[in-house]
Amino acid sequence: MNSFNYTTPDYGHYDDKDTLDLNTPVDKTSNTLRVPDILALVIFAVVFLVGVLGNALVVWVTAFEAKRTINAIWFLNLAVADFLSCLALPILFTSIVQHHHWPFGGAACSILPSLILLNMYASILLLATISADRFLLVFKPIWCQNFRGAGLAWIACAVAWGLALLLTIPSFLYRVVREEYFPPKVLCGVDYSHDKRRERAVAIVRLVLGFLWPLLTLTICYTFILLRTWSRRATRSTKTLKVVVAVVASFFIFWLPYQVTGIMMSFLEPSSPTFLLLNKLDSLCVSFAYINCCINPIIYVVAGQGFQGRLRKSLPSLLRNVLTEESVVRESKSFTRSTVDTMAQKTQAV
């Protein structure tokens, strides 16, 4: 996170009269994972299975369409970011199982968690880009007809990835491997040591650019889209409302704990009780944020087609139907069919 990222098992009271045999645990609790860590492992496992399968299917479907369809470009990039994030999960999983011991070395400590951050921020920023695109389609249809092309879409994606990279650089630069003397353990985390101000600056920038700004973009865009959609009686849809709420709420809910604890930890002394408590919850907050990486395919399926009459079909068949339908896949994560539908017929083949 924003401060040194680790927790340790409770080794209990070490009595001078007892032998400290490092070949065995110091006490029985040392082999027991904390409840937040167990919950994090469960979430990681579910996110990995759903995220890899779901996003792989999205990538497979959208890859064929990406050359000619703008919405396919959005979903391809989004799915790639989520998919790559999910691939890194076994490493986090292994580290938590080993009480946050990091057996992967210094280079892996710098690169792997930074890649995870890169992909997660890319997902957020791409989601904000998609929202902006939805907004333009509804409110600037003529502009879209003239300028909304695949080239511009790829540039927008490149900007999103670039900004994600910028957000990740501090984490990469300050990431170190620390070997604790007792209990013997190698830890991987961010160590700002002498530069608390820089740590706070990184946390604030991350909060604003990686959370508040995309959240604001999503909320404003979808509020205006909803108002426009609902102002047209013929296109009024409770499904649209549900999807918009699902998109914004899931983004907000799953990222909130990570961002709040991150900003709090950057302002707290590492030895303070509050910091230590938040540090124990760190893995759970990260795993909670990771739910964003598998939620998209779920929203595509649930919101895109609804449950009725679809549960009888197999999952691959269901996903194929959802992801290949123009009115669903090519409409945005919000699946607004309203005023966009008529525009879509003119612009989707760009």
């Epitope: 080794y11 070490y14 070949n23 620390r178 070997e179 003397y181 590492p270």
Partner: antibody
Amino acid sequence: QVQLQQSGAELAKPGASVKLSCKASGYTFSSYWIHWVKQRPGQGLEWIGYINPRGDYTKYNQKFKDKATLTADKSSSTAFMQLSSLTYEDSAVYYCVRVTGSEGPYYFDYWGQGTTLTVSS
Amino acid sequence: DVVMTQTPLSLPVSLGDQASISCRSSQSLVHSNGNTYLQWYLQKPGQSPKLLIYKVSNRFSGVPDRFSGSGSGTEFTLKIRRVEAEDLGVFLCSQSTLVPLTFGAGTKLELK
């Protein structure tokens, strides 16, 4: 009372090996780790490594991994440090130290008197 | 490795003065359990070091209360309220949070 009695001064030639000893008394030898520390004349202290006398578990400073070998003999309550392939830079005072602490072996509470090693041709 | 930087290297004092020695670490010494394992030792000429302060601010048994330690993270200070003749020697800071364990170069407390 707790005591760590180290062997006397050593004079060795470059390339040779030497084995320093540290006899513990006044406490249960196998219950406390023994660390070894190097101090060159007019310089600071350098941590070499430690041994857990009960399980013969050792941990070394990477800098001394190929230089020092730590062993312990529970029957005589003695810890040993062998220094190999001696060079002039190995000339120093070597301390054995016992560690303690309420929640782990974090503090050096009892020190030996030190063994002076001189490497000279 | 964690570099422990002590200042000053030499501190001339008069008996009864207050003395202050600083120790800075290149990395945070906060352990994952929340404790900071920073110790202070005093080494008198021709003797082995003796433990004065452990865990930043805790006096070891038998250490007079004129010795006090403070600090957090990477910045630490040892204060001697009224210097006595038996206090003269080299003061060393040391960390046992991270491997390898490291020591400062020492601060020589001497009479003016």
